[in-house]
């Protein structure tokens, strides 16, 4: 039987001569040469060789166990003269044995990693971690050590985990952002003799919010015209924030200030500067200087950092409004203003008055803008603002003058304001009333006295404040002898009356009435009308039966009468 | 006078790409975030992204519907913005205009006169 | 995100008169960050109004806007024939958000 299973080869030999392995022996060799040894299997004859005759192998080259541990070979014995096997075909091991051959590799060559600022003592950054080809099972070829070589006293590593913790207290973002930690992995436990291999870990503190904002100076100026519509920007300020992102977000806000109400400010999103904006309209007149407390604050704090103190700061902010060349303004948004139509030309009417706002109080003139008075019925004084008449009234053909008056600065003519002026025309008698219509009426030949043929009205332009009140009467020269009469009905209304029974219009076809009809008002006006009169035929009913012509065909103001 | 004037705009086939450009002048325009926002023929406004000034990083900021697919960029020395759309879809058919927010960088002041983007097959 | 709801989504009015166009948001937002803009057809936005009350430039003053926390308000006084248009609401927050829109139309 064979009297061997595996053999032991060390790796990485360096002799001259072939490394010897270890011998092939069966208990049937006689020592004579008459049996002949075979290996076959991994790497026989080109890696292992044997000597047919004695049995003893050999390694041709040199061997790494990193490389192929284990080798599996087969043996044979036969008899040389027969050709036949002494011994069953055998299987066996050669192990290579390890040595510490190979340093611990890290798996990465550059680790990146973050850690936030400020963080405690211990915090965890990154785990590196590193390996041995050598053989774990053996020795302590494979047992690796982590050390640090470079970045202490900021950071430790773990000997055996390889985790990177922080190592000091405070490290401060703002003071030192990148951090280069060199670490090492030794092998024999980090004995001496010991193999080792390096990495670098890049570590960058990462921002947390332990800095709040600071205004860079603690009073600001800004000038802004009074005309700035609201909504206006009017100056920036920027709080610096050593912090990043967003804990360096700022809010600004307006705490404390006469003009609180009146400005705003908004944070530039990108640029995170404080916007100071006009809120409402300014008035260079009433307030020329405001001063503001303008406060910066983060809005996302963090409460471990409170301690640093009040994470918020303020400056003073002046605002001088400037004065801007305001046109005049007038003492109302409009007038109304009444004259009598009666009034004499050059009659003053009553007086505008329009003053320069601005704090100089430039001297202003006055006009009439001459698109709205184009018949001139009107003039001002351009020093005092007195509208007066330059033209004869009438209420009766004009009730209401619209005009616009112009108020304009004399030392800048730039600057100028209107204002409407609505002047009433008052009522003066000066309209006699007069018939409503053109009146022609008839009676019958047969007419019986005081029969009413006509109803009478008047009209009259004027509009008196108590109403009108009309009085009807014949005419002087007709009022003796008349075959008529006229009763005044005392509600601006006249009746014609027959006088007699009976007409003959053979006789007398027409009858001229000559109507006196006056106002109640003063001066008393007054106007005489003509009625005409003609006679006709009619039937028993009083229906007119035949006229002359000329009375049959006037169009209107016929009147049956009775 | 702040002038925003789109370019690039055409006629592409749905899966297809196209890159729009905006020249902008008569502002600082690296003070300023800019934006892209489209409206498809008959409908509403739809903002499209967003490219924050350097201070910010050049942060980008997407609608859902084009995100993974359109990437907007700025070149700051050319007063440029620019808009990359890959994978173009019939949906992305619409006029595209370049806007600058007002002072602050609130709202959107300022409009080019828009670019006709047309996916169709 | 935000959601900005306007409403009415569609109005007729005639001239002269006064119309009131609201914005509701589905989550608390600063005024600060809430703005109004008049487009016309075939024509780019218009700002109107930032930062929930402050007109921008050249804008009349028959605009006005109002509102804080989720509710805010367009009004515009005595509407005027140029002033026919569809108009939109958007806050600040990333992402951006506009309301639906808001078409004014003649009576």
């Known amino acids: 039987s064979w009297m061997w299973n595996q053999f032991f080869l060390l790796e990485e030999y360096t002799g001259s001569d072939y490394q010897y392995v270890g011998k092939l022996h069966s208990d049937q060799d006689r020592g004579d040469g008459s049996l002949k040894y075979i290996l076959s299997g991994d790497g026989a004859g080109d890696l292992f060789i044997i000597n047919e005759n004695t049995g003893d192998i050999q390694a041709t080259k040199r061997l790494d166990r990193e490389e192929k541990p284990v080798y599996i070979l087969r043996a044979q014995a036969i008899n040389r003269r027969t050709g036949r096997p002494v011994e069953p075909e055998s299987e066996f091991i050669i192990k290579i044995h390890d040595i510490n051959d190979n340093e611990p590799i890290f798996t990465k060559d550059v680790y990146t990693a973050t850690v936030p600022e400020m963080a405690d003592v211990g915090t965890f950054v990154v785990q590196v971690t590193a390996t041995d080809a050598d053989d774990p099972t053996y020795g302590n070829s494979a047992k690796v050590v982590y050390s640090i070589l470079q970045g202490q006293p900021y950071f430790s590593v773990e000997s055996e985990t390889g985790i990177i913790k922080t190592a000091l207290l405070n490290m401060d973002r703002e003071n030192r952002e990148q951090y280069q930690v060199v670490i090492q992995a030794k092998d024999m436990g980090g004995q001496m003799g010991g193999l080792s291999g390096t990495t670098t870990v890049n570590i960058t503190l990462t921002d947390v919010n332990d800095n709040p904002p600071r205004f860079p100076q603690s009073t600001y100026q800004f000038k802004t015209p009074e005309s700035s519509p609201p909504g206006t920007p009017i100056g920036r300020i920027k709080a610096s924030d050593a912090d990043v992102g967003e804990n360096a977000e700022i809010e600004y806000s307006i705490t404390d200030g006469e003009g609180h109400d009146m400005f705003d400010v908004i944070t530039d999103q990108e640029t995170q500067e404080g916007i100071i904006t006009v809120k409402k309209l300014l008035d260079f007149e009433k307030k020329r200087v405001y001063t503001l407390k303008v406060e910066a604050s983060n809005p996302h704090i963090e409460p471990r950092f409170l301690y640093l103190g009040p994470f918020k700061d303020s400056a003073t902010v002046r605002i001088v409004v400037d004065d801007v060349d305001e046109p005049p303004v007038f003492s109302k948004p409009a007038y109304i203003l009444q004259i009598r139509e009666d009034a004499q030309i050059n009659t003053t009417i009553g007086s505008v008055a329009a003053q320069d706002p601005d704090a100089a109080r430039n001297p202003v003139k006055y006009s009439v803008d001459r698109h709205t008075d184009m018949d001139r019925i009107f003039n001002i004084d351009s020093g005092n603002g007195s509208i007066f008449t330059s033209k004869l009234l009438d209420r009766e053909t004009l009730l209401w003058h619209n005009i616009t008056v112009i108020a304009t600065e004399i030392n800048n003519p730039k600057q100028s304001s209107r204002v409407p002026l609505y002047i009433k025309v008052l009522d003066v008698n000066d309209n006699a009333p007069e018939f409503a219509e053109f009146y022609e009426t008839f009676v019958c030949e047969k007419a019986k006295a005081d029969q009413l043929i006509q109803t009478l009205h008047a009209v009259d332009k004027d509009d008196p404040y108590s109403g009108h009140q009309f009085s009807f009467s014949l005419a002087p020269e007709a009022a003796s002898g008349s075959n008529f009469t006229i009763q005044d009905n005392k509600d601006n209304t006249a009746g014609i009356l027959t006088r007699k029974n009976g007409y003959n219009r053979h006789e007398m076809s027409t009858y001229l009435l000559p109507v006196v009809i006056s106002d109640n008002d003063y001066p008393v006006q007054s106007s005489t009308g003509t009625v005409t009169v003609r006679v006709c035929a009619c039937d028993h009913h009083g229906n007119m039966q035949s006229c002359h012509a000329e009375a049959l065909i006037h169009p209107t103001g016929l009147s049956t009468g009775a | 006078e702040v002038q925003l004037v789109e370019s690039g705009g055409g006629l592409v086939q749905p899966g297809g790409s196209l890159r729009l450009s905006c020249a902008a002048s008569?502002?600082?325009?690296?003070?300023?975030?800019m934006n892209w926002v489209r409206q498809a023929p008959g409908k509403g406004l739809e903002w499209v992204a967003r490219i924050r000034i350097k201070n910010n990083n050049y942060a980008t900021y997407y609608a859902d519907s084009v995100t993974d697919r359109f990437t907007i960029s700025r070149d700051d020395s050319k007063n440029s913005l620019y808009l990359q759309m890959n994978s173009l879809k019939t949906e992305d058919t619409a006029v595209y205009y370049c806007v600058r927010p007002d002072y602050g960088n609130y709202g959107l002041a300022y409009w080019g006169q828009g670019t006709l983007v047309t996916v169709s097959s | 995100d935000i959601q900005l709801t306007q409403s009415p989504s569609s109005l007729s009015a005639s001239v002269g008169d006064r119309v009131t166009i609201t914005c509701s948001a589905s989550s608390s937002i600063s005024s600060h960050y809430l703005h109004w803009y008049q487009q016309k057809p075939g024509k780019s936005p218009k700002l109107l109004i930032y930062r929930s009350f402050y007109l921008a430039s050249g804008v009349p003053s028959r605009f006005s806007g109002s509102g804080s926390g989720t509710d805010f308000t367009l009004t515009i006084s005595s509407l005027q024939p140029e002033d026919f248009a569809t108009y939109y609401c958007q806050q600040d927050i990333v992402p951006l958000t506009f309301g639906q829109g808001t078409k004014l139309e003649i009576k």
């Open positions: 008569g502002f600082t325009f690296t003070t300023y975030a």
